[in-house]
Structure formats: C-alpha cells, structure tokens
C-alpha cells in the first residue's frame, strides 16, 4: 500500500550491523508523486565501489546511487549527509554485508517523502499537446481557443469531423485554409451521394500544400480517400501528387486528414460532384446492343438481341433477347445472361430408321436420318438431312421440321423364286421369295401383306372368323416354325360391302367381290422374310393382258397331301375369262350356269397344271409391276376355281384399290397419317 | 395318311447302346420333322429330340445331351435314334412322332417300341 | 429348357364333376401349349393346341385357356372315357418339354 513517508534503518542499528546480509526495501508512495530519500547517519565500511559493504539505491532499472563510509552534513542546520530526489512513484534501497568487518560499524538511518512532481517540466517528453497545467500529485492538459482535448486527455485536436455532404456537387477544404492546418488533428469528411452516382473529385496542383514524406517515404501528414473497398493516397507534399480528376465507381466517399504536432502548412481545398455511374460497354458475344451508344450510364436501358441461331437461356426458356439496365452500382443487370448457340436437343428418333448420334446439337450442325434399308425407304423425300436452325428445330430443307417417314419398300423379294421340280404343278418356295405371304391358320388359307398394319386377303377367308390369327416370316407352317414367326393379330376384319354374305357359305357360286381388309392391332416390322407386296396402279398399265405371267405361292392342297408343310409356288399366265368358264366345275353345289363370272375376276393357269387349290385362297397373284421390274404387285387375289390343276379365278385387285386406298386411310391411327 | 412303323422290341444290357428306327409311308420324310418320345413304365412322357430341316440341325433335350443320336436316311423315307451309355432307367416305349402344322404339336405317332435295360 | 409343372399330380372326381387341372410354365410361352389325354397301353391323344384350340373330334366338354406362363384344361363334366392321365406340352421353342401328368382317377 503506498505511504506518502517512512523510515529505512539498517540491521541492529544503531548498533553494529552483523555480517554478510543483503536486506531491500520497496518504497512506494502515491501515483502523481515522487520520492525524496534522505540519509541522517552513514557509517557502513569503507571499500573501493562499495564493493565490500554497500547501500544500493534503485529506481526501476536505474541505479540511482551506491553508497558506504563515513558522511557527516555540510549544514550545520540540517541533519542530512546524502540525498536523492527521483520524479518517480517507486524505490528500492538494497543493504548488503561481506563475511568480515574490521571494525565496528553501525549502518544507516534513512527518511523518504511523497513529493510533487512537476508532470510538465520534469520529463524530456512533454505529455501535452498544448498547455500543461501541474498541481500537487498531477498535472492537466488545456488547450487553446477553437481547440479541444481529445479523449486521451493529452491532445488537442480542431473538431473537424463530421460533415456529411449530400448535395451532387460541392467544395471541401482543409480546416482555416489556406491559413495553417491544425496540429495533431484527424478530419474526417463523408460524401454520400444518391446511388447510381459516383463521386468525382478534381484538385489543381497548386491547392494542395501539406507537409511532405519523411526520409522513408511516409507521409507525416495526410489527405487519403476512401470509396469502398478502394482507397486512393496517402497524399502529401507540395502540389497534390495523384491524379487531379478522380472517379471513385463510388456514390460514398470518406476524406481522412491526418496531421501530426509539427510543421503545419496551408492545406488543401477541393471540388467533387456527382456522375452518374457509368456502366461499361461490355462486349457481348453473338449479340446486338439496342440502342448503341459510346457511354452507358446509370438508368441506361439497352435491349440485347441475339443473332440468328443464339439464343439467352434462362431455367428452361429460351428467348432471343433481353433488357438490361445500368444498375447504381455500375453493373449490368442481367449480365449473368449469355448468347449462346441455339440447341436443337438431341433429334428425335424415328419408327424404322435412325439417326446417328450428332457430334453436336447446337445451331448450325447438320444431322442425317436414313432408313432401314434396303427393308424401308424415306416416303417424305427431303434426303434426310436436318441442320439445327435458329429457332431451336432440326429443320430439313424440304420438309422443315417435320421429320422423315420410314415406309415399308413394297413388292421386292430379298430373293427371286426360281421354278424347281414340279409339284399341283408348282415348286418349293422359300418366304423370301413371297415376303408378303400370310399364312391364315383358321381357315387354312393365305393373305398379302401390303403394308405394317395391312393385310390383303379373299373375303370368304374372314367371313367365317373374324377374328383370324395370321403369321409371316416363315416357309414351314410346322408348329416349331410358326412358334418361332411373327404371329399377327387382327384388330378388325373389313369385308367389300360388294361381297354377299350367305347363311350356307359352302353352296356359294358367285365369288364377285371377294376381297378383304385386316387391320392389325400393330405394326409388322419388315425384314427378309417379312416385306408388302405392292398394290397395283390405277393407269392402264396394270391392266392385264392374256399371257402376262403371275406367281402364286401358298400351303394349300397338293397332289401329295391337304396342306403343304412348306410354302409352295408356281408361275402362270393371265388366261382370258372363257378358259375358266369351260372347265368343268369338280364337285359343284348348284348347276355350271349357276357359277358367276365379272369383270372383278381374272382367270389364270392351265399351263402344265399349274394351280392354287384349296388352302392358298387369299394369297396374291403376284406380277412384276410394268414400271419398276424389280417390283411385284399384287394383281389378283386366290378367290375359287373350277378345279384344282387347270385354271383358277383370283379377285382383280386393280379394281379395289379405290376402296383399299379408301378403308386404310379411314381407319389409320395418327402415327400412320 | 401318314404311318410310321417302328422297329421292334429290344433288350439290351447296361453301358451298351440301342437303335430304334422308324419308317415313314404315305409321305416322304423331307416333307415332315420327326420327333422321339419316350414313357418309362408307369411314368410320365418325355420329349428326347427331333431334326429341324429349317435350320439344318437336330435339337436333344438336355437331359440326353451327349448319349443320343437322331439320324435320317431319306432314299428308304426312315428315321433312326439311337440311345447310348444304357442305364436300367432308360427302359421305356420310345416314340417317333411327326410334327403337325398350325400349332398341333404331333400329327401321327409311331407303334412305340419298348427297349428293356436289364443285366 | 423350360419346366412345364403340373397340378394337382392327382385328382379324384365323380362323374358329372367340373374337373380343372393347371399347367405352369418356367418362362413365358404365349398361347404355345398342348394338352394330351393317355390312357394305360396308349399313345398319347391331343385334345387341345394353341392353349384353347380344340382339335377336331374331341368333345366340347373339353375347353383350354391361359397364356404366358398361366393355362388351364377344364372338363366341365367328367365321363367315364375321361379317366385318364393328362399331359401339357409347350411348344414354345425347341425344346418341347412335357409337364408330369395329372392322373385323373374316379372318387
């Protein structure tokens, strides 16, 4: 606890201090004071630097003395030998003793006091800036008029800061410009301007006079601008150094002055005012500025339009352009937003055919769809190249977007029947052969596929069953073949209206009519052995003349057996209607003159007994179309005969493709349209 | 009408080998597919194999994969399967069948013919 | 190969009974099966092809049905000719397997 005085006496005094003790004492009087140690009576053994017996008088880190002997006073009024006076708070006096004393020494007496210090005048640093003021135990620092005491109580500083300028333009100088700056002052001035402006600032050199840069380069006083995150200075000497125009891109500006105690100069003065914050002209690839101009600035509104084949693609949605506006902070809105080439997606595939996969799907890469050949061919024309266009589609130059049809190639036989050894009449046939051959189980009989959702048969085929299971692709009807083939199913059976139903199917004589259509409840995919045969045209190239030669192929009767195992065929010529008239009817159900002839039959055959029988009824009569020979179409239809093995009649197809072309286009589904 | 006449009854002993034959009449047999069945007394029927024409090859069941071979000599019209490595429960009636048409799986059967395993 | 399995291995039934047996198969076969009767010393007799399809001279007491691995022979009223053992085959794909059999005996 601190004394403001005390007594300090050595060992056993006034008797004969004892031998080797080293003793301190820790003086400690109030803060704001300092300590006068006096001594009254010294007689401690005499050595060259105290070295053997001393007293030590310590403040801080300072030895302020080291004394030993015999002292006696100056004064005859005064008791003092020795005296120490420190402008400090805190003593220590240290007492040390060797091993021997060759005489009798008694030690010290010694008395310390608080005293004043003068805080103003006793230390080389000065602790005010301005005016110090002491008084016992302290001292308090005062300032001149217009100044006041910072709150470290020392400095005194000009109150400077604290301005806020608003208006967008405006004038801000160095305080008693152009007189001397204060010392030792921190002025802060803040510009805040209304957003999207920024704050600029213009200086002439000969306005600007602050005391320079010392030796290292650091300015003792400084003029220093702060926008943001950007600071522009220190600035300090003769002449402003820094550009005499700044654009801060900032509507807030701080000004920091800085002086230090010395050297005070006339200061600075300087204009600002508001500009609008300009937005850079940003290059924007692939795109056209609307309205162009050489400087954009804040409220500017500009449309940006893609060119042809970009598009701006924002979530999901794609547009061709957008708005952007120079926003307060100089930034574009939108400015996330890019032109990018326009990408039609992968294209989409198509029923029979396809379409490699594109090295890319943006604007401009081209695309090609072909068909399963040599089975499918491209109805539609257009040569099935796409390129990606603008707007997004795969776009072929002849259809647009719409895409290329893969329709089934008709009439051609992957390979040509060749006549073996005879069978009635007929050879071993391979399904290749007749790919449009259609094998009915029940009845057992034929049909011609004519395209994927279309069979082509007799009408006293279906008009017992309705409900006919048909199969393609195979030359044995065999159970493990037929397992193995394209089983088709019916959708719905349409019978000519022409045709007259009757309550006893196996008495009929007239065959007039006899043509139907089976619509399949899915398309049949082409191959090989599965292809249509073609239908005839309606010019009078495909009327047929007396021996012109037609194939025939079917499981029907054989001389051999009921029903063939495997697909048997044979060519014959077109005969004229008479032949079939004059044979003799095998096992007629009503009288010879019962029996209908029309114009809707062809009669052929007759030619080495070669015939259909029972069991072929519905397959075509196949003959090579007269404008594409590598084309089959189906002239006839298998209807009824005489006898089996001479001539037989067959539904002339030419004069239904009307209502073939009628019955399929009424009832396709969407796809087919 | 198809008739398929069968070779006649065999004993044989285990580890030798049988061949049973089967002559077609009423038809030729490049026109048919034949099948063998067999039935061990008191059990059930089992389908053995049988010469796709189609395909060119003859199709064994699993089962006899290895011990069975189906032949044809078609200048005499007759089928042949022989049965190797017999064990006593290879006894049975063994079948030749042709194959129908339009989803009948046989259209005539042989007279069988038994073939005892016995040592 | 495929497995045909057969149920029940045994039925006992009265004349004038609805009789129904079930054939399973391992893997679909569509409509591709066949049912056989068999008497004792006798080559197996089709009844049914194609599942539902009655071959010609069998009575209409006999009726198919099923497809994909699910099929059905019904008898809708026993007669003493059909006490029997009945097999289904399918004929899917080479291999043709038969099922066990179903021994059809009188109550």
């Known amino acids: 606890e601190p004394t403001m005085y005390g007594e300090i006496l050595s060992p056993n005094y006034p008797q004969a201090y004892p031998s080797e003790v080293e003793k301190s004492w820790d003086i400690e009087v109030p803060e704001g004071y300092g300590i006068h140690l006096y001594f009254t009576h010294l007689d401690i053994e005499l050595s060259e630097n105290c070295a053997y017996d001393s007293v030590q008088i310590i403040s801080g880190d300072t030895e302020e003395g080291r004394l030993c002997g015999q002292r006696s006073s100056n004064n005859p009024h005064s008791p003092i030998v020795e005296e120490f006076q420190v402008p400090y708070n805190k003593l220590q006096v240290i007492f040390k003793s060797d091993f021997s004393n060759e005489e009798r020494f008694t030690g010290f007496a010694a008395y310390y006091v608080a005293t004043d210090i003068n805080e103003c005048t006793d230390f080389v640093d000065v602790p005010c800036s301005h005016f110090c003021n002491n008084f016992i135990g302290g001292y308090f620092c005062s300032c001149p008029p217009e100044y006041f005491l910072h709150d470290d109580m020392k400095n005194c500083g000009v109150n400077c800061s604290g301005d806020v300028f608003t208006a967008l333009i405006g004038e801000i100088a160095s305080p008693n410009y152009p007189k001397p700056y204060p010392e030792n002052s921190r002025c802060e001035y803040q510009i805040r301007l209304e957003k999207g402006f920024q704050v600029v600032v213009t200086l002439r050199r000969e306005d600007f006079d602050v005391e320079a840069a010392d030796s290292a380069g650091n300015c003792l006083d400084s003029l220093v601008f702060v926008a943001g995150d950007r600071q522009f200075g220190p600035y300090c000497g003769h002449g402003f150094p820094g550009p005499l125009n700044i654009e801060t891109k900032s509507n807030a500006l701080d000004i920091i002055f800085q002086t230090d105690l010395t050297g005070q100069k006339k200061g600075w003065k300087l204009r600002y005012h508001g500009d609008p914050m300009p937005c850079p002209k940003e290059d924007t690839p692939n795109s056209v500025w609307e309205p162009a101009k050489a400087k954009y600035v804040f409220r500017d509104v500009v449309q940006i339009t893609c060119l042809d084949g970009f598009e701006v693609v924002e979530g999901r949605v794609g547009a061709t352009s957008f708005y952007s506006t120079c926003q307060s902070n100089g930034k574009w809105s939108n400015s996330k937003l890019k032109c990018q080439p326009v990408d039609c997606g992968i294209p989409e595939s198509i029923e029979n055919g396809k379409v490699e996969d594109p090295e890319s799907t943006l604007f401009g890469s081209v695309i090609r769809y072909t068909c399963e050949e040599p089975y499918y061919y491209m109805e539609n024309g257009g040569g099935g190249e796409y390129h990606c266009a603008g707007n997004g589609s795969w776009v072929n130059e002849v259809l647009g977007p719409e895409l290329p049809k893969c329709v089934p190639v008709c009439g051609v036989p992957r390979e040509p029947f060749e006549e073996k050894q005879r069978i009635i009449g007929g050879s071993d046939a391979d399904i290749k052969n007749f790919p449009w051959q259609v094998f009915f189980d029940n009845p057992w009989a034929g049909g011609a596929l004519i395209n994927e959702y279309w069979v082509l048969t007799a009408a006293h085929v279906v008009e017992g069953n309705r409900e006919p299971t048909m199969y393609v692709g195979s030359t044995s009807v065999q159970t493990s073949r037929l397992a193995k083939s394209k089983m088709l199913t019916p959708e719905h059976v349409f019978i000519h209206p022409g045709w007259k139903l009757l309550e006893v199917p196996e008495g009929r004589t007239n065959f007039d009519n006899d043509i139907a259509l089976v619509r399949l409840k899915d398309p049949v995919k082409m191959g090989p052995t599965v292809s249509p045969i073609c239908l005839p045209g309606t010019s009078s190239d495909y009327n047929l003349m007396d021996g012109d030669l037609g194939l025939i192929s079917g499981w029907g009767r054989t001389e051999k057996r009921d029903r063939a195992v495997r697909l048997k065929a044979a060519r014959l010529p077109v005969a004229p209607l008479r032949k079939c008239k004059e044979v003799k009817v095998e096992k007629p159900t009503a009288d010879a003159e019962a029996y209908v002839f029309t114009p809707n039959m062809i009669c052929a055959g007759g030619e080495k007994g070669m015939d259909s029988c029972k069991g072929d009824s519905g397959g075509a009569f196949a003959v090579q179309d007269p404008n594409d020979k590598t084309k089959f179409y189906a002239a006839g239809l298998v209807s009824w005969g005489p006898q089996c093995g001479t001539y037989g009649l067959y539904t002339r197809v030419k004069n239904y493709v009307d209502w073939i072309m009628k019955t399929m286009q009424e009832n396709s589904t969407p796809r087919e349209d | 009408e198809v008739q398929l006449v069968q070779s006649g009854a065999e004993v044989k002993k285990p580890g030798a080998s049988v061949k049973v034959s089967c002559k077609v009449s009423?038809?030729?047999?490049?026109?048919?597919?034949m099948h063998w069945v067999r039935q061990a007394p008191g059990k059930g029927l089992e389908w053995m194999g049988t010469?796709?024409?189609?395909?060119?090859?003859?199709i064994y069941a699993q089962k006899f994969q290895g011990r069975v071979t189906m032949t044809e000599d078609t200048s005499t019209d007759t089928a042949y399967m022989e049965l190797s490595y017999l064990r006593s429960e290879d006894t049975a009636v063994y079948y030749c069948?042709?194959?129908?048409?339009?989803?009948?799986?046989?259209?005539?059967w042989g007279q069988g013919t038994l073939v005892t395993v016995s040592s | 190969d495929i497995q045909m399995t057969q149920s029940p291995s045994t039925l006992s039934a009265s004349v004038g009974d609805r009789v129904t047996i079930t054939c399973r198969a391992s893997?679909?076969?569509?409509?591709?099966l066949a049912w056989y009767q068999q008497k004792p010393g006798k080559a197996p007799k089709l009844l049914i092809y194609k599942a539902s399809s009655l071959e010609s001279g069998v009575p209409s007491r006999f009726s198919g049905s099923g497809s994909g691995t699910e099929f059905t022979l019904t008898i809708s009223s026993l007669q003493p000719d059909d006490f029997a053992t009945y097999y289904c085959?399918?004929?899917?794909?080479?291999?043709?397997?038969f099922g066990q059999g179903t021994k059809v005996e009188i109550k």
């Open positions: 893997q679909s076969i569509s409509s591709w």
């Open positions: 069948v042709t194959e129908g048409l339009a989803g009948i799986p046989f259209d005539s």
């Open positions: 085959q399918q004929v899917n794909s080479l291999s043709w397997t």
């Open positions: 010469f796709d024409p189609e395909e060119g090859e003859t």
């Open positions: 009423g038809d030729t047999l490049t026109e048919l597919s």
